[in-house]
């Protein structure tokens, strides 16, 4: 069982100075995705603290993927901290906020939200249930937090996390100020299994964020949500890696056994924007 290949590595206060990330996705592992193309891309490595090259398969993957070394550095390295902190007051939205609404190719139509760049607000749209693009949010709040301008001119952010004391699961938490370290897996990994609207009975896997494991479920063949994987391995790769299991000074972070253990201290800091 590939889940057993994972272990908890304690994050201690020793050996390395605090790691401070500009964006949550900078903490994601390089993800080549399931496709077979060979594309040179860059990702930020939280262990070496540098932007490094990797080969991308051409589809899926995650946001820790950049066309150029410069773009990676701009988004993820501390050299740019001051510049980014300053520009947070008029911070650019993520690129995907400017994408057109995209219903995708499926026909299990559900209500989702997208940022409408013409009206400068989040609006509902008809989503087919698969594919499409990242300008696609399950809730109005998530869309607003990521793509709409906050009341003080900076982006309100929704990548912060808090530990749910009831079930020890991670839940998104809106933060009203930009956060230097925001660690969050793909949002759909937090959604419940959704059979969808059709009548098939396909074997699929979903990530159960309460127990922290990938579990099987029967998929109807259309609709549903993105927490839907054809194999357990794919589910684990997409959702389990990088999820913080307990947030505290000596918090835990999941790592693979095959990786050399590395100790990292993660500093949780927030910039409070003052009147200038």
């Amino acid at each position: 069982d590939s889940e057993e290949d994972e272990e908890h590595t304690i994050i201690t206060d020793t050996e390395l100075p605090p790691l401070k990330l500009m964006h949550s996705f900078c903490a994601f592992k390089a993800d080549d995705g399931p496709c077979k193309a060979i594309m040179k891309r860059f990702f930020f490595n939280i262990f070496t603290r540098q932007c490094e090259e990797f080969i991308y398969g051409g589809c899926e993957g995650n946001q820790n993927r950049f066309e150029s070394l410069e773009e990676c550095k701009k988004m993820c390295t501390r050299d740019n901290a001051n510049r980014i902190i300053k520009t947070t007051l008029q911070q650019e939205k993520p690129d995907f906020c400017f994408l057109e609404e995209d219903p995708g190719i499926c026909r299990g139509y559900i209500t989702r939200y997208f940022y409408n760049n013409q009206t400068k607000q989040c609006e509902r749209f008809k989503y087919g249930g698969c594919l499409g693009n990242m300008n696609n949010f399950e809730t109005l709040e998530e869309c607003k937090n990521i793509c709409e301008d906050g009341p003080n001119g900076f982006q309100v952010d929704n990548y912060g996390t808090q530990l749910n004391a009831v079930n020890n699961s991670l839940t998104p938490q809106s933060t009203k100020v930009p956060s230097l370290f925001e660690f969050h897996g793909p949002s759909w990994c937090l959604t419940p299994a959704d059979r969808g609207l059709c009548r098939a009975n396909e074997n699929r896997f979903y990530y159960n964020s309460v127990i922290g494991k990938c579990r099987p479920f029967k998929y109807s063949g259309c609709g549903g949500n993105e927490n839907n994987f054809t194999s357990k391995q794919e589910c684990l790769r997409a959702c389990k890696k990088g999820f913080i299991q307990r947030i505290s000074k000596g918090g835990l972070i999941k790592t693979k056994r095959k990786r050399k253990k590395q100790r990292v201290k993660i500093a949780y800091e927030e910039i409070f924007v003052k009147n200038m």
């Epitope: 559900i110 209500t111 409408n116 607000q121 989040c122 609006e123 809730t139 959704d194």
Partner: antibody, heavy 119, light 108 residues
């Protein structure tokens, strides 16, 4: 004051088409969705589709996609619904109703247009 | 499509009594997307409750809504004469948007 004023009653023969209008006032027409909902005599409500006039975004109920056409005239703040190939079961009261861009709270409704299909 | 089934079809009660109207969905619907409308004879429907439990402007506090998943309820704690009408539940979580067939609340 927000108002949706619909056109008058229609009597049509099977196979014909009907075009209903809904004139909006008292709000920014292009900033809201306009829905069309029908109600057959003594029956429930059935959603036909919606149009957002600013960008011409339209969502249809698949059941009506081949027969219903939603349009909007921004200059007159008027929404239209045309239903073709009418049959007796299309006899109903047809309502227009507006909702915001973030939810489907149909907070204002027209008075309804009665369409009777009979040979 | 999601089918909303309302029960009972007709509910006969007297003023002062408690009314419980049910709405059952064929598939799970997020509570944020479940609304209720009131309709009186010869009138257009009126938005009554949004997001399962949020009363629309002007709706008396004797009305309440609850539920999650596939089961939703509209409750009137003590019926007043003006409450007798038809109530429709409505979902917009999935397309096409659908309504229940309605529960007619009539005076006994």
């Amino acid at each position: 004051e927000v108002q949706l004023v619909q056109s008058g009653a229609e009597l049509k023969k099977p196979g014909a088409s009907v075009k209903l209008s809904c004139k909006a006032s008292g709000y920014t027409f292009t900033s809201y969705w306009m829905h069309w909902v029908r109600q057959a005599p003594g029956q429930g409500l059935e959603w036909i589709g919606e149009i957002k006039p600013d960008q011409g975004r339209i969502d249809y109920n698949e059941k009506f996609k081949t027969r219903a056409t939603l349009t909007a005239d921004k200059s007159t703040s008027t929404a239209y619904m045309e239903l073709s190939s009418l049959r007796s079961e299309d006899t109903a009261v047809y309502y227009c109703a507006r909702s915001s861009v973030v939810d489907v709270a149909m907070d204002y409704w027209g008075q309804g247009t009665t369409v009777t299909v009979s040979s | 499509e999601i089918v909303l089934t309302q029960s009972p079809a007709t509910l006969s009660l007297s003023p002062g009594e408690r009314a419980t109207l049910s709405c059952s969905a064929s598939s799970s619907v997020s509570s944020s997307y479940l609304y209720w409308y009131q309709q009186k004879p010869g009138q257009a429907p009126r938005l009554w409750i949004s997001g399962t439990s949020i009363l629309a402007s002007g709706v008396p506090a004797r009305f309440s809504g609850s539920g999650s998943g596939t089961k939703y309820t509209l409750t009137i704690s003590s019926l007043e004469p003006e409450d007798f009408a038809v109530y429709f539940c409505h979902q917009w979580s999935h397309y096409p948007f659908t309504f229940g067939q309605g529960t007619k609340l009539e005076i006994k």
